[in-house]
Amino acid sequence: IWELKKDVYVVELDWYPDAPGEMVVLTCDTPEEDGITWTLDQSSEVLGSGKTLTIQVKEFGDAGQYTCHKGGEVLSHSLLLLHKKEDGIWSTDILKDQKEPKNKTFLRCEAKNYSGRFTCWWLTTISTDLTFSVKSSRGSSDPQGVTCGAATLSAERVRGDNKEYEYSVECQEDSACPAAEESLPIEVMVDAVHKLKYENYTSSFFIRDIIKPDPPKNLQLKPLKNSRQVEVSWEYPDTWSTPHSYFSLTFCVQVQGKSKREKKDRVFTDKTSATVICRKNASISVRAQDRYYSSSWSEWASVPCS
Amino acid sequence: RNLPVATPDPGMFPCLHHSQNLLRAVSNMLQKARQTLEFYPCTSEEIDHEDITKDKTSTVEACLPLELTKNESCLNSRETSFITNGSCLASRKTSFMMALCLSSIYEDLKMYQVEFKTMNAKLLMDPKRQIFLDQNMLAVIDELMQALNFNSETVPQKSSLEEPDFYKTKIKLCILLHAFRIRAVTIDRVMSYLNAS
């Protein structure tokens, strides 16, 4: 058993049929010595008396809020949560496996630049009685500070018969140099509590590997005289690290109709302009990627050809 | 190796082309190592990230763009020097183009070159003959060093009398290649910045 936060405790259980469970001793936080009784949740049934209560925790029915009282007055609470371990593996029932970039990916993180700010998100089908808490650091043995905000519900989607909820959190490394060469990864730890079930999820990454620039901005077309070709120009996104001559981007320019199966014109360039062939009912799209370290491409920025 | 046929953009900052080749060569070599050593811990997640130049050179700090010198997090051990030297500097005069930066890059390359050559000598003794260093990568390191045109004491190639542990050598190769790729990215960014200055 360990303390998650004040008066909240996590009991780690090997989860299999007829498992013996864990013996837990609860102590009432009071100077009083006698006349103390214990109850669980909203029940008035007295579970025991005395300053300490010993219980055998085997299942979710044994978890919950234990309260010690004296003469009708509440002295203190202890909330017990369960963390299940099945076949030596901690349960991952609360969050959905996003399967990208690989299986067992529950947390996904992205950074728009090298400033040390990043966003992580996760998915669940659970809509109520759900809380998250996020901690992060650079390295684990001698951790350096990363400050994370509160996790918030950022999107709701309908997937078939199910509703899916996306939560996200923003974190910022306390003293980040955009030009630094990372040797210790960022560690992100998410504590998830659904009703009386506790789970924790972790992700470890270098900022350089989760870079995904914002799309290029200010796309403009200039038709070339006596030609089907147009010159398309754009600018670096405002959120990208500066100076741009040090943090350079490379771009992919594509002309395509509405369907992905349609024919297209595609060219890669390090410049902020390119010449392409425009077709009726097609769009010109441009996306960006770090020129020197190939992490993710940005989303497309698009303008119609006509 | 074949002699180059055409020299692109003759006015270009001389080292930019070499640094681009360097990043390409080390990235290819790392990819090859990952594929060939698929049953060894050779991915970024599996290896320990070591920097053989740590406390010996200060490339990131010495080559920091002027715009980032206002960022206190970037100034841990920054020593500024505005002396210009080395053939890559051509005749451009900007305070960023400091000898310290380019000589630090040169020292990095020299250290990695020695490590790679020592390692290759060991890998050539491996009866499995599983992986060797790409000669192109070694040649590109050499070309960039020549373009930087700094003179410094020759570092003797390490020779070891004991029987090499090939498993450890291959893991060390992965560690070295990952670190060198990260340094090559920094070098490329620096050269691109210098070229634009």
Partner: antibody, heavy 118, light 107 residues
Framework: QVQLVQSGAEVKKPGSSVKVSCKAS????????LHWVRQAPGQGLEWMGW????????EYAPKFQGRVTITADESTSTAYMELSSLRSEDTAVYYC???????????WGQGTLVTVSS | DIVMTQSPLSLPVTPGEPASISCRAS??????LHWYQQKPGQQPRQLIA???QSISGVPSRFSGSGSGTDFTLTISSLQPEDFATYYC?????????FGQGTKVEIK
């Protein structure tokens, strides 16, 4: 299976014109760009131009501008390349080729040998 | 026009050995570079798109690398069927241009 079948070999006199055809099968004809590339005996590949069969848009290499005409007939899924004012150095194998991507080629025809000789 | 220069023009290789062909552009073309193989009396066949993207159906021993002005086609271990002429082609701008070709011959 996408296939491009070209017309047979031709022998032409200098100053005359030649029209080579290329019939496409497999896939929708207008879903692809069609290119013409030639190869003189023992020489490398030389791009001549492309056509978008959907709208008839064309682009020619400056070297052939004014001498080459590429057309397409959607009803028969056939593209044509006509080269006029032939000279002996136009002796080559002419390939039609196609791709959904405009700037490179993934499927080639078998080639048509055009010999220009007096 | 962008001039593509291949080297060497002839490359004698022992079967089973690796081979590397170089292609250089007269100006920077990013990764807008494609590789083709042509056997005598046959039409060309696409091998690599955009400098390093492999094409389905092409053996994994063929790989491409490079960006900017310098590109390489590598055959990790030459098979008897790989003896042919190889061409690079730039798609950075029109007109599309090819290298002169590199003939890989049996040593």
């Amino acid at each position: 299976q996408v296939q491009l079948v070209q017309s047979g070999a031709e022998v032409k006199k200098p100053g005359s014109s030649v029209k080579v055809s290329c019939k496409a099968s497999g896939g929708t004809f207008s879903d692809y760009y069609l290119h013409w590339v030639r190869q003189a005996p023992g020489q490398g590949l030389e791009w001549m131009g492309w056509i978008d069969p959907e709208n008839g848009d064309t682009e020619y290499a400056p070297k052939f501008q004014g001498r080459v005409t590429i057309t397409a007939d959607e009803s028969t899924s056939t593209a044509y390349m006509e080269l006029s004012s032939l000279r002996s150095e136009d002796t080559a194998v002419y390939y039609c080729a196609r791709n959904k991507e405009l700037r490179y080629i993934d499927v080639w025809g078998q080639g048509t040998l055009v010999t220009v000789s007096s | 026009d962008i001039v593509m220069t291949q080297s060497p023009l002839s490359l004698p290789v022992t079967p089973g050995e690796p081979a590397s062909i170089s292609c250089r552009a007269s100006q920077s073309i990013s990764i807008n570079l494609h590789w083709y193989q042509q056997k005598p009396g046959q039409q060309p066949r696409q091998l690599i798109a955009f400098a390093s993207q492999s094409i389905s159906g092409v053996p994994s021993r063929f790989s491409g690398s490079g960006s900017g002005t310098d590109f390489t086609l590598t055959i990790s271990s030459l098979q008897p069927e790989d003896f042919a002429t190889y061409y690079c082609q730039q798609s950075n701008s029109f007109p599309l241009t090819f290298g002169q070709g590199t003939k890989v011959e049996i040593k």
